[in-house]
Amino acid sequence: MSVTACQGLGFVVSLIGFAGIIAATCMDQWSTQDLYNNPVTAVFNYQGLWRSCVRESSGFTECRGYFTLLGLPAMLQAVRALMIVGIVLGVIGILVSIFALKCIRIGSMDDSAKAKMTLTSGILFIISGICAIIGVSVFANMLVTNFWMSTANMYSGMGGMGGMVQTVQTRYTFGAALFVGWVAGGLTLIGGVMMCIACRGLTPDDSNFKAVSYHASGQNVAYRPGGFKASTGFGSNTRNKKIYDGGARTEDDEQSHPTKYDYV
């Protein structure tokens, strides 16, 4: 696969993943009422990171935001933080990767700069994806713990209801946002890895160039071994260029080869 394709695909996959992370963060259905014992319910509860909602069978839905910071569980705060960090890193990653794309010309930016930016954006996407996956997983773990705790106390005589009165506790299970978050985090991670792979194809590597032979006299001849393009136009062959006509020349100078930037 060509570097451009790998980089482009990595960018697109990361972009889709990033959009998914934002969607998951904003979704209200991080946890939904468990309907295993009662599949037909008159009141359906579901909760997100920012608000909890109730949907009645009448169709009326009411959502209430969590208007407190101090009163919220530390785990929920941690999940919020992880998702926001993931989004922030994703935004930075997207901005950096746009400038790093090989198919976009920006002034006289050379390939080594683009390689560094591609690597940077790749790492940002990887961290962003990991943040999302960890955030969602922490929330899922919290749900599982609470689920089994509420199962153990399913019919309790507490909460001001004395005697034999049953108080059925609402149990919550995985909501759609968790699955969106896991998939989105995974995509962002994969996209980031692809960007990092593409970076390897853009990185100037001296070992890939042939040895330099000197034809000249004893004078000091300046030469540069790397011959990197100043522009980022497609299809131009990058060959090592002589600085002086009579100066250092490489053994490849006489031939035109596909460059290392065109194929991986």
Epitope: A42, V43, N45, E56, F60, E62, T167, T170
Partner: antibody, heavy 118, light 113 residues
């Protein structure tokens, strides 16, 4: 304004079946579930079941499942309840009612009196 | 199924008196998601269909006189008529709107002396 129109009394033979209608007007018929409630003479209210006119989803009280069938005709904004294998215990007033906010039955029809007698 | 128990089954009062009707459910009707009690009160006058009075245990339906108030939470609920009028002669029902099947109390018949 919201109106639920139910026809007059029905006299049916034991073992027969009857189909009661409830014509809705004054609101978007498919936006609200329709409920049916039974009231025997001098007795309390008993919930029969509900139907969602938008997708014909039904939910029945276990006591009425099998003997009652709820349907809708969206084109005429009418809900129907068919009661089969009628017995004297089915003699009652049957109300249709529209479900509203708070899972309340906010609007009721006038009720159809069904008398099962030979 | 949630069983709704109303008390008393009937009561006779004089106009202007304060009346309280009780309703007890076999399970809590308090929904943790919105902290609302799914308990509804209806008034049924002779020869008429029931009329919605109060929902969410304490929210008065529009058009209902403010002498009618609902209170309670969890499993114990009360309908209070602050100053009974002659037109309040009716049967009052409580209803569970929290879980299927919807269930009604047996009713409280209010008679005016």
């Amino acid at each position: 304004q919201v109106q639920l129109q139910q026809p007059g009394p029905e006299l049916v033979m034991p073992g027969a079946s009857v189909k009661l209608s409830c014509k809705a007007s004054g609101y978007t018929f498919t936006s609200y579930r329709m409920h049916w409630v039974k009231q025997r003479p001098g007795q309390g209210l008993e919930w029969i079941g509900e139907i969602d006119p938008s997708n014909s989803y039904t939910n029945y009280n276990q006591n009425f499942r099998g003997r009652s069938t709820l349907t809708v005709d969206k084109s005429s904004s009418t809900a129907y309840m068919q009661l089969s294998s009628l017995t004297s215990g089915d003699s009652a007033v049957y109300y249709c009612a529209r479900l509203g906010r708070g899972n309340t039955l906010g609007y009721w029809g006038q009720g159809t009196s069904v008398t099962v007698s030979s | 199924d949630i069983v709704m128990t109303q008390s008393p089954s009937s009561l006779t009062v004089t106009a202007g008196e304060k009346v309280t009707v009780g309703c007890k459910s076999s399970q809590s009707l308090l929904n943790s998601g919105n902290q609302k009690n799914y308990l509804t009160w209806y008034q049924q006058k002779p020869g008429q269909p029931p009329k919605l009075l109060i929902y969410w245990a304490s929210t008065r339906e529009s058009g209902v006189p403010d002498r009618f108030t609902g209170s309670g939470s969890g499993t114990d609920f009360t309908l209070t008529i602050r100053s009974v009028q002659a037109e309040d002669l009716a049967v009052y029902y409580c209803q569970n709107g929290y879980s299927y099947p919807f269930t009604f109390g047996s009713g409280t018949k209010l008679e005016i002396k």
